[in-house]
């Protein structure tokens, strides 16, 4: 009863002569355990005998005997884990057919048939390709062999055009009840160059011997692969020549569908064949050409061909690095004349005259000068001829005003206070002079351009300079005006003594002045309107207080005379001419007030007084006035005073005070 038995195995096992087979097998029986297991080769059921007959390859008896001559068959299963796996090693062609697994339990019997296919020679593996191969898109190639056996080592190897492939493969084996196989999977990125190439999967034995193989031709879809050819095969052509470019499609899978041509990346109109012909080429057809060809995979662009159309130089023009150029600066001249090939020789012209020794595309004048100004033109020459000379370019050389001089328009000599007219002149200038500058700057009148009027000229206007200016100022050498003026800065200066003047000192005063033009001068000294001397110095051998006073000196030259400020001469001396005065007279009545005053002449003034009696006794009074109040008869006598300043002391002569009795006193007596 089939419902009681469940046996799993691959169904068909493939092998070849001399190899082995490994039959994975599991079983399950519903009623009881397996008691007997017999492996038949091509079993047939004998109806009469009600049993299977055939070659017995294996029989599980109590002692697990194998029929004689069948040691190559091994039953690898056991009853405990329901395993019925078996192997035949080696296997032979005549083992092909059915393997019958006769299984008997206590109550049930079953015959399971497994197909065994043993070929004479090792059968080839099968290469499986994905439905589409496209360049640079990785794919997995599979090589499948319906064989695997633990006792027989094999290896699958991949080859491309007979050479082992460099890509790594993943080899896997299956020995399960579902399937028995050996598989090699190789992943790689097909390139367009692989299209049409043969990929082989080889089956090798343990010794590396090739047992069988399978081959497939790769169909790698790819964009067109292009090369471009030029006829004639030179990409440098002359103006007027004809050129043909051919776009060669070296490979395209699938076939190409569209063709277009591009020049400098821009499609050319109505050019959609593999051949591009350019008739009577012009300069404008110089450029980079390529063809673009598309198929279902996508577009492809060829390498670029640089077509150069040669022509004689075109009319030239001159480019000047700077115009106007500043005198002394560097100026570069460039001859621009489109030509192919580039000009090899240049001729330069200045104002129509050939410039000698200049044959390059550009030349340089390191320090430009005014005479370099003018029109520059050039001619360019290449192998196809000499180009036309263009109209030329103007060089303007600018420079500051040259040879600037200054002229005094006045008759000389010039005196302080005069009006002076100066003019500023120059020889040449580019651009024209547009203003003038003057030094020193003053509130001076400029009646016309380049003329300066100085009214009421100062004594100190010694030198004046002018500049003529355009974009730059050029200064003339300063002109000395030589202004004549009366002596200036006249003053009295004490030479000696260095300190304050004391009576009796030797004193010298100097009459100083700061400047005079002309230099020749005379001196005059004056005190209180009186002329004292005509030397630059005024000397006192022994100064007296009477010499004190206000002094002035005068200095004169041919232009005029100048007086100093009044200078006060001060003489210091000790108190002198002391005398005692009594405002109430020499005679005073007792009881009244007697006032004695000490009068003196001193410089500086007396700061301390002392009083003495007829006995030269110092009195306790220190002021200028001595007050006796009330006066007594005993006060009668002679008195004198002493005055002190920081220079010294002086004293007065004696003066006699007489004090008489009052009538009251006399009456009492």
């Amino acid at each position: 009863d089939s419902s009681k038995w469940n046996i799993e195995h691959p169904g068909t096992i493939y092998a070849w002569e001399g190899a082995c087979v490994w039959v994975p097998c599991t079983y399950r029986v519903l009623d009881g355990a397996l008691e007997t297991f017999i492996l038949f080769h091509n079993p047939e059921y004998n109806q009469n005998m009600s049993k299977f007959e055939g070659t017995r390859l294996y029989e599980s008896t109590k002692d697990g005997k194998v029929p004689s001559g069948q040691k190559r068959v091994q039953f690898l299963g056991n009853k405990i884990n329901n395993n019925c796996t078996l192997s035949i090693h080696p296997v032979h062609v005549n083992d092909s057919g059915q393997l019958g697994l006769r299984m008997v339990s206590k109550t049930e019997k079953w015959m399971e048939r497994i197909h065994l296919n043993v070929s004479e020679r090792p059968f080839p593996p099968r290469i499986q390709l994905p439905p589409k191969l496209q360049e640079s898109q990785e794919v997995t190639l599979t090589c499948l062999l319906n064989f695997s056996c633990y006792g027989y080592q094999i290896q699958l190897q991949w080859l491309l055009e007979g050479v082992p492939m460099r890509q790594a493969a993943v080899t896997s084996t299956s020995l399960s009840t579902k399937s028995v196989f050996t598989r090699s999977e190789l992943k790689f990125s097909p390139q367009w160059s692989h299209h049409g190439k043969i990929v082989t999967c080889e089956l090798h034995d343990v010794d590396g011997k090739v047992l069988s193989e399978d081959m497939v031709q790769l169909n790698v879809k790819h964009t067109p692969k292009l090369t471009i050819e030029v006829t004639p095969n030179e990409t440098i052509v002359r103006k007027g020549d004809s050129v043909t470019m051919t776009c060669k499609v070296n490979s395209s899978n699938p076939e190409y569908t569209t063709v277009s041509w591009l020049k400098d990346g821009i499609p050319l109109k109505e050019q959609n064949t593999l051949m591009l012909t350019l008739h009577e080429v012009t300069k404008s057809q110089t450029g980079r050409y390529c063809c673009r060809v598309s198929n279902d995979v996508g577009p492809a662009t060829s390498e670029k061909v640089f077509l150069q159309v040669q022509y004689a130089p075109e009319p030239s023009r001159v480019q000047i690095s700077q115009s106007p150029a500043v005198e002394g600066s560097e100026v570069n001249f460039l001859c621009i004349s489109p030509a192919n090939p580039l000009p090899t020789n240049y001729t330069w012209y200045h104002n129509g005259k050939e410039v000698q020794g200049r044959t390059e595309k550009q030349f340089q004048i390191q320090k430009i000068l005014p005479w370099h100004a003018g029109t520059y033109s050039c001619e360019a020459e290449n192998i196809l001829g000499i180009g036309e000379r263009g109209p030329g370019t103007e060089l303007d050389v600018q420079y500051p005003p040259k040879k600037v001089t200054m002229v005094i328009e006045n008759p000389t000599p010039i005196r302080e206070g005069d009006t002076v007219t100066l003019s500023c002149n120059y020889s040449s200038s580019n651009p024209i002079v547009n203003h003038y500058e003057w030094r020193p700057r003053g509130a001076w009148e400029e009646p016309s351009l380049g003329v300066l009027k100085i009214q009421n000229i100062g004594w100190n206007n010694t030198a004046v300079a002018c500049a003529a200016c355009n974009n730059w100022c050029s200064w003339a050498s300063p002109v000395t005006l030589n202004v004549l003026y009366a002596p200036r800065g006249v003053r009295v200066r004490k030479i000696k003594p260095l300190s304050e003047i004391h009576s009796g000192n030797s004193v010298s005063l100097q009459c100083d002045f700061s400047s005079s033009h002309p230099k020749e001068v005379q001196f005059f000294w004056e005190k209180n309107g009186s002329l004292l001397g005509k030397e630059s110095q005024l000397n006192f051998d022994s100064i007296s207080p009477e010499d004190a006073g206000s002094y002035s000196c005068w200095v004169n030259n041919s232009i005029g005379q100048t007086a100093s400020k009044a200078w006060t001469l001060e003489v210091l001396y000790a108190p002198r001419r002391l005398r005692v005065s009594m405002s109430q007279g020499n005679q005073v009545m007792e009881g009244k007030t007697a006032t004695l005053t000490c009068e003196s002449d001193a410089n500086p003034p007396v700061y301390s007084y002392a009083w003495f009696d007829w006995n030269n006794q110092s009195l306790p009074y220190s002021g200028r006035m001595l007050r006796l109040e009330p006066v007594k008869v005993q006060h009668s006598g002679a008195y004198w005073c002493q005055g002190t300043n920081r220079v010294g002391k002086g004293h007065s002569p004696l003066i006699t005070l007489t004090v008489y009795y009052s009538p009251q006193t006399i009456g009492r007596r």
Partner: antibody
Amino acid sequence: QVQLKESGPGLVAPSQSLSITCTVSGFSLSRYTVHWVRQPPGKGLEWLGMIWGGGSTDYNSALKSRLSISKDNSKSQVFLKMNSLQTDDTAMYYCARPHDFDAGGFAYWGQGTLVTVSA
Amino acid sequence: QIVLTQSPAILSTSPGEKVTMTCSASSRVNYMYWYQQKPGSSPRLLIYDTSNLASGVPVRFSGSGSGTSYSLTISRMEAEDAATYYCQQWTSYPLTFGAGTKLELK
């Protein structure tokens, strides 16, 4: 010229995951395969896995459960992610590119990034 | 996976001497690749596709072999060649490297 440069965290705690970026220049990731190889200190080289131009991956079966390789073609970056790190994952991690699109030996290597697995 | 065994592990040699190191694969490989690595630097591709010299590699380096047996040879050792050399297979995933041969100067 072809250049590869790895950048990684340096230190990873045990049981944590590792992320390394390989930034490439001089070639297109859409055409070439990029592989990851590691080298423990003082030891030999071990192939970890690869990513193909089209984005499919192959891994070393011993590490397959913990590995993930991905990429961003526009940024020219390939990423390696490895989970459940242990101390024996301490190694110098390299990204490399073969001589050809998909084979021919590792002609180009990054300078490597050292990953230390430690608490 | 394919296991690559490099020998010797350490190799000491003098300048000017010829050096040969080997790499044995656990199963057949199509091509072998060789790298040089100096301390603190990334590996550098020396040999690709078994015998081709990578760009900028001196001609004193050469590679050979097939199947499971490959070798790297330095015709005349120079001081700058002191480094660790790794072989690598690109036949079967996962890609694998040898454990390395450390080349030292005597």
